[in-house]
């Protein structure tokens, strides 16, 4: 059918609660395109009727709620004027046993989000809530080891739990709960978070510094091989991840099928006060679709990008 297949990373989800996935793949979805969702290679599109438990909402697929039998491979087909891309998303649904007040047991959060708080600092946790505009998200409550979090040190602000003067006792199993309202019906979203504590020292304000790139464009010929280093300085005992992303997805996942663009192995040089890290991105063959797209180097909270640009024509 002339559609290019793209395979996204697996999503592992909790049953009996809402879930949504947005079909975005720039630069494809940045222009005039139509998006249609399908399940398990079915020729029949996912319903667009908002009363349906599973339906398409603009570019999103929305499950209200997700159920055990919803596991499978979902495809979204993005059709442009001159292009067609089929994105495959593998959704795995499992039963999650959260705190049952009658049992009083702790939730098993090992497979849920993992977040870090920094000892002695003011820090925060995030409740990740990704839903279309049609979903109104209500007040968020936070729990630690099944008890609602209260106290002067904790402030619930939007999707975050601000924690002042983090202590070792703040490690543990957390959950954030939000009420989602859609078409007059209410649903509960409950996300588990495993929190660990780190003693990161301060270097340059304890924010990793990206030496290169510097948010700039690189002129490169079509079809050539290109390797770009991301150089980062950070504290010796930092816990930051360094990686290359495109469209907020790891490049290795984004180009999982073709492996045309890959992230290299991280190396580092140790200095007295800090480490210098290098992680590269390799374009085995630069294609037209790579131009104008920001390839982001992430280092903790720091980001910097490169944008590939066609060289100006030489009229000599």
């Amino acid at each position: 059918d002339g559609c290019k297949d793209i395979f996204m990373k697996n999503e592992i989800l909790s049953a009996s609660q809402p879930f949504a996935f947005n079909c975005t793949f720039p630069p494809i979805t940045s222009g005039e395109v139509s998006v249609t969702w399908y399940k398990n290679s079915s020729k029949i599109p996912v319903s667009k009727i908002i009363q349906s438990r599973i339906h398409q909402d603009e570019t999103w697929i929305l499950f209200l709620p997700m159920e055990w039998g919803d596991s499978g491979v979902y495809q979204c087909v993005i059709k442009g004027r001159d292009s067609c891309h089929r994105i495959h998303v593998n959704l795995t649904v499992f039963e999650k046993h959260w705190c049952d007040t009658s049992i009083g047991g702790l939730p098993n959060l090992s497979d849920e989000y993992k977040q870090i708080l920094h000892l002695g600092k003011d820090d925060s946790l995030t409740c990740h809530l990704h839903f279309p505009k049609s979903c109104v998200l209500g007040p968020i409550k936070w729990y630690k080891d099944c008890n609602e979090i209260k106290g002067e040190r904790f402030t619930v602000l939007e999707t975050r739990l601000l924690v002042s003067n983090v202590s070792a006792e703040d490690r543990g199993n957390y959950a954030c709960q939000a009420i989602l309202t859609h078409s007059g019906k209410q649903y509960e979203v409950l996300n588990g978070i495993t929190v660990s504590i780190t003693e990161r020292a301060g270097y340059g304000g304890s924010v990793p510094k990206i030496i290169y790139p510097k948010n700039h464009s690189i002129e490169v010929q079509l079809g050539t091989t290109l390797i770009v280093d991301c150089n980062v300085t950070d504290t010796k005992d930092n816990t930051n991840l360094r990686c290359w992303r495109v469209n907020n997805t790891l490049v290795d996942d984004y180009y999982d099928e073709s492996k045309r663009i890959r992230e290299g192995v991280e190396t580092h040089v140790s200095f007295r006060e800090h480490n210098l890290y290098t992680v590269n991105i390799t374009f085995l063959e630069v294609k037209m679709e790579d131009y104008g797209l920001p390839f982001m180097c992430h280092a903790g909270v720091s980001t910097a990008y490169i944008i590939l640009q066609l060289p100006a024509p030489d009229f000599r």
């Epitope: 995030t126 209500g138 968020i140 939007e158 999707t159 924010v207 907020n248 903790g300 909270v301 980001t303």
Partner: antibody, heavy 120, light 112 residues
């Protein structure tokens, strides 16, 4: 629609206290923080603190921690901000403000402002 | 406290021309969750402030699309593609990454 209506202008003497009210309507009062921001004449904006009607939780800018008290009357969906030991530099317009939504920050809703003049 | 520094202090613009205001924060406002906790407000004469941009680049409800926000973790820009007479007032940047919430000193925009 969301509306925040504040009490009228006040003139106070140095050392006195002032209590400004902010009556909320058009949303579930107990779901949102109510923020207080002040603006001295020809000056910028200064965040004083915020109050959550559920559990009477207050988070204050340290600059005001000894002088500001925030309270509420749930029956009338009203939040109060009391500033004590007034000095001339407290002369300002005091605003109450509410965030865009429960998960998106930024003050999308503001009261009309209450001018407090401190003068001997 | 996070310090927000705005430039310029004032700006005089011809209607229909573009305008740009800058703001710098003393700490990166880009959170680990990939959200940048940065905002732009406009206070028109005699009115309370109004939200223009939230989370660095999102247009608030009812704000004309001639306004746009961009930036990195510490350096931010508000652009008006074509200034109109109704855009006069004082523009403030703000952060809510952490408490206390802080505002920039303001940039006064007037029409030539």
């Amino acid at each position: 629609q969301v509306q925040l209506v504040q009490s009228g202008a006040e003139v106070k003497k140095p050392g006195a206290s002032v209590k400004v009210s902010c009556k909320a309507s058009g949303y579930t009062f107990t779901n949102y923080w109510m923020n207080w921001v002040r603006q001295a004449p020809r000056q910028g904006l200064e965040w004083m603190g915020m109050f959550h009607p559920t559990g009477d939780v207050t988070r204050l800018n340290q600059k005001f921690k000894d002088r500001v008290t925030m309270t509420r009357d749930t029956s009338t969906s009203t939040v109060y901000m009391e500033l004590s030991s007034l000095r001339s530099e407290d002369t300002a317009v005091y605003y109450c403000a509410r965030t865009t939504s429960m998960i998106i920050g930024g003050f999308a809703y503001w009261g009309q402002g209450t001018l407090v003049t401190v003068s001997s | 406290d996070i310090v927000m520094t705005q430039t310029p202090l004032s700006l005089s613009v011809t209607p229909g021309q573009p305008a740009s205001i800058s703001c710098r924060s003393s700490k990166s406002l880009l959170h680990r969750n990939a959200i940048t906790y940065f905002y732009w407000y406009l206070q028109k004469p005699g009115q309370p402030p109004q939200l223009l941009i939230y989370q660095m680049s999102n247009l608030a409800s009812g704000v004309p699309d001639r306004f746009s926000g961009s930036g990195s973790g510490t350096d931010f820009t508000l652009k008006i593609s074509r200034v109109e007479a109704e855009d006069v007032g004082v523009y403030y940047c703000a952060q809510n990454l952490e408490l206390p919430l802080t505002f920039g000193g303001g940039t006064k925009v007037e029409i030539k």
